[in-house]
Interface confidence: low
């Protein structure tokens, strides 16, 4: 027999056994030109010493073979003795190590068997009623196709599915969408209405994320507030990466999960913008304010679940960086100014009412005054901080008040509002004999002591009523007792106590009159 013809003789080996796991498979035959044809197949197993024979049986029952040696591809013409206009059955027999292995058969009409291309170029992926819809342009001159898909997850093997017949310039397929795992899809096509004809190769992988983006399991830490009044938010634990099927493990577009950080500044609600969204990679600097932080995961199908944290306000307070002067017209605050044209947000809230909304005021952009101070004033009629109670005051600054991440804390401190002098006056002053020449004086703590850092000291004044001599004794703000020594028996004394702040001298308590009795010896 000539090599270019199909040999109508018995092949030079014994009968084939198709029961082996190895051997030839995936035979496909198709027309490649007006009179030229090609068959190709895969061979599974060791290839050394393997000879392949392409077998063909005509509708008449006559059979022939092509010997291809070690090649797994054969081209022949319509003159090779194989009928191209009628149905033929083809298969491959591979002879090796004194045994023959046979491929599955294909039955087709060679002339009508055109090699179809898989979907090429951009395959559009969308979600439709809980399913996955893939759409692509039909390859040139190949309208009319049957389409199959196969899909797998990171933990499963390929599963085959059918897209049904296609007969248009664009083709589409509805496929199952997994809720929580990524999938890899491939598509293939063959000519519509020619059951025995060969399938195209599989398309490039189409990588599809789960319907639900994963819960963003991350952890944050917040650094301490720096001297510039800002603290860095850092990511302690990156989001876990989505497990991907084998064909999607390179830079696979389509399965990416993007994480965004949504920042909501809770303090200073009167500022222009309270919320900002930024990429998770771009960790921001924050002021010392309280924030809610959400990490939002999203994929090509939209946003997924988010995880929310509360970042408490930095409670570190400055030692008296704020000066408050109360005059007849009203009250003015002074503090060390930031750069030119800075907007300040002054926020205050009664201590113990942290759940309620703070009072908030935004200044116009202001420059430092000649003393390098910034100011904020209000009238007595406004009633601001007018009650006798402790207020927590925080001042924030920004040169760009509309940019949420550019706010910084200027200071955080406490202030006792209203008539602090009267409200802070110590009460319940008592005097007890301590020894022959000393007494113990104690009093109820001043209301000012409820306000952290506000009470600077107590002062105890003792006046000798005989000589009008006065002595003053400073007492730590945490103490409410002092011993007065070197007193003379029989002399009348008055004692008073006052509570002072850094900027305000308190009012004296009611005078307590006492004397040490003279000891009479027997």
């Amino acid at each position: 027999c000539r090599t270019s013809e199909c040999c109508f003789q018995d092949p030079p080996y014994s009968d084939a056994d198709s029961g082996s796991a190895s051997g030839p498979r995936d035979l496909s035959c198709y027309r490649i030109s007006s009179a030229g044809y090609e068959c190709s197949w895969q061979y599974e197993g060791p290839t050394a010493g393997v000879s392949h024979f392409l077998r063909c049986c005509l509708s008449s029952g006559r059979c022939c073979y092509f010997a291809t040696g070690s090649a797994t591809r054969l081209q022949f013409s319509d003159q090779a003795g194989v009928s191209v206009l009628h149905t033929v059955t083809l298969w491959v027999e591979s002879w090796a190590r004194n045994r023959t292995e046979k491929s599955p058969e294909v039955t087709l009409q060679l002339y009508k068997s055109v090699k179809y291309k898989p979907p090429l170029g951009d395959i559009k992926v969308s979600k439709l009623a809980g399913q996955l819809r893939m759409e692509w342009e039909t390859p040139d001159n190949q309208v009319g196709a049957e389409v199959q898909f196969r899909h797998r997850t990171p933990s499963s093997s390929w599963k085959l599915g059918d897209c049904g017949p296609q007969d248009d310039d664009t083709e589409s397929c509805l496929c199952p969408l997994e809720m929580n795992v990524a999938q890899e899809f491939q598509l293939r096509r063959r000519r519509l209405g020619s059951q025995g004809s060969s399938w195209s190769k599989w398309s490039s992988p189409v990588c599809v994320p789960p319907e639900n983006p994963p819960q963003p399991q991350v952890r944050f830490s917040v650094e301490q507030l720096g001297r510039d009044g800002r603290r860095r938010l850092t990511l302690k634990e990156q989001p876990t990466q989505l497990e991907l099927p084998e064909g999607c493990q390179g830079p696979a577009p389509g399965v990416e999960v993007t994480y965004q950080l949504q920042l909501h500044m809770l303090s200073c609600p009167c500022k222009a913008k309270a919320t900002r969204t930024l990429p998770l990679e771009k960790m921001p600097y924050l002021s010392g304010a309280a924030y809610n932080v959400a990490v939002i995961s999203s994929n090509r199908f939209g946003p997924g679940p988010n995880q929310t944290w509360h970042i408490p306000a930095d409670t570190h307070t400055e030692p008296v960086a704020l000066n408050i002067s109360v005059g007849t017209n009203g009250t003015t605050m002074y503090w060390p100014a930031r750069a030119q044209s800075t907007t300040y947000c002054i926020e205050w809230q009664p201590v113990g009412q942290e759940g309620s909304l703070a009072t908030c005021n935004l200044t116009a952009p202001q420059d430092p005054d000649p003393a390098g101070m910034a100011t904020y004033s209000w009238s007595r009629e406004s009633g601001a901080m007018g009650q006798e109670k402790c207020y927590h005051i925080t001042i924030f600054a920004s040169a760009h008040p509309k940019k949420l991440t550019l706010w910084s804390t200027v200071l955080s401190t406490y202030h006792f509002g209203g008539n602090a002098s009267a409200a802070g006056t110590p009460h319940h002053v008592s005097v007890k004999n301590h020894s022959l020449d000393s007494v113990s004086v104690d009093w109820a703590p001043s209301l000012l002591s409820t306000c952290p850092g506000v009470l600077k000291e107590y002062v105890v004044r003792c006046r000798d009523e005989d000589s009008n001599q006065v002595s003053e004794h400073p007492v730590q703000p945490t103490e409410t007792q002092v011993t007065l020594s070197d007193l003379r028996a029989g002399v009348a004394y008055t004692v008073q106590v006052r509570a002072d702040t850094a900027w305000l001298r308190g009012a004296w308590s009611q005078p307590q009159r006492f004397s040490i009795k003279v000891q009479v010896s027997d």
């Epitope: 819960q215 399991q217 679940p305 988010n306 995880q307 929310t308 944290w309 509360h310 113990g352």
Partner: antibody, heavy 119, light 110 residues
Framework: QVQLVESGGGVVQPGRSLRLSCAAS????????MHWVRQAPGKGLEWVAI????????YYADSVKGRFTISRDNSKNTLYLQMNSLRAEDTAVYYC????????????WGQGTMVTVSS | QSVLTQPPSVSAAPGQTVTISCSGS????????VSWYQQLPGTAPKLLIY???KRPSGIPDRFSGSKSGTSATLGITGLQTGDEADYYC???????????FGGGTKLTVL
């Protein structure tokens, strides 16, 4: 609305095991730490265990350490308590409770499920 | 024996004020926020006070909480018959790495 529903209670012999479940709805379950708290008949509340939102950290009361395991399945919005080597003193109503996002208080409680350990 | 100590019972007439104490140590109440829970007969506990003195929405301002050192106090003013319940304090214990509760206080409205 925000709800926690416990199930899995019943009568069990000493030394045997039981698994309690707590189904959460109406809130983002995976953002909250979750507790199990129990109450023996006529007695006060006794904390049993806590699990952090991601399931990566757990703490137990000394009385159940080594016998009970707290776990969660965030995809099913469910909290579990696996109770092994049960004793008569484990007889109680078992409540699951949600830890608030913004403070450490248990702000939502289930209605409880009764576990009776008796031979 | 509970880690936090509460009086077993308190009673008062309607309209009166009552306080329930809860004492612990520096590792629990001293270091951490205290919560208070109300358990009406036959029902699950309900959060009454958190962070020592804050009320969740829906809790009337008749209920108040305070903390001083290693002790906390629950105050109820204008007592109503519907306030009859068991009240528990709870907090985190930094040494035990555990949540600890008081033994509970039964409030009777006479």
């Amino acid at each position: 609305q925000v709800q926690l529903v416990e199930s899995g209670g019943g009568v069990v012999q000493p030394g045997r095991s039981l698994r309690l479940s707590c189904a959460a709805s109406g809130f983002t379950f995976s953002s909250h730490g979750m507790h199990w708290v129990r109450q023996a008949p006529g007695k006060g509340l006794e904390w049993v265990a806590i699990i952090w939102y991601a399931g990566n950290k757990k703490y137990y009361a000394d009385s159940v350490k080594g016998r009970f395991t707290i776990s969660r399945d965030n995809s099913k919005n469910t909290l579990y308590l696996q109770m092994n080597s049960l004793r008569a003193e484990d007889t109680a109503v078992y409540y699951c409770a949600r830890e608030s996002l913004l403070n450490s208080a248990s702000d939502i409680w289930g209605q409880g499920t009764m576990v009776t350990v008796s031979s | 024996q509970s880690v936090l100590t509460q009086p077993p019972s308190v009673s008062a007439a309607p309209g009166q004020t009552v306080t329930i104490s809860c004492s612990g140590s520096s590792s629990n109440i001293g270091n951490n926020y205290v919560s208070w829970y109300q358990q009406l007969p036959g029902t699950a506990p309900k959060l009454l006070i958190y962070d020592n003195n804050k009320r969740p929405s829906g809790i009337p301002d008749r209920f108040s909480g305070s903390k001083s050192g290693t002790s906390a106090t629950l105050g109820i003013t204008g007592l109503q018959t519907g306030d009859e319940a068991d009240y528990y304090c709870g907090t985190w214990d930094s040494s035990l790495s555990a949540v600890v509760f008081g033994g509970g206080t039964k409030l009777t409205v006479l």
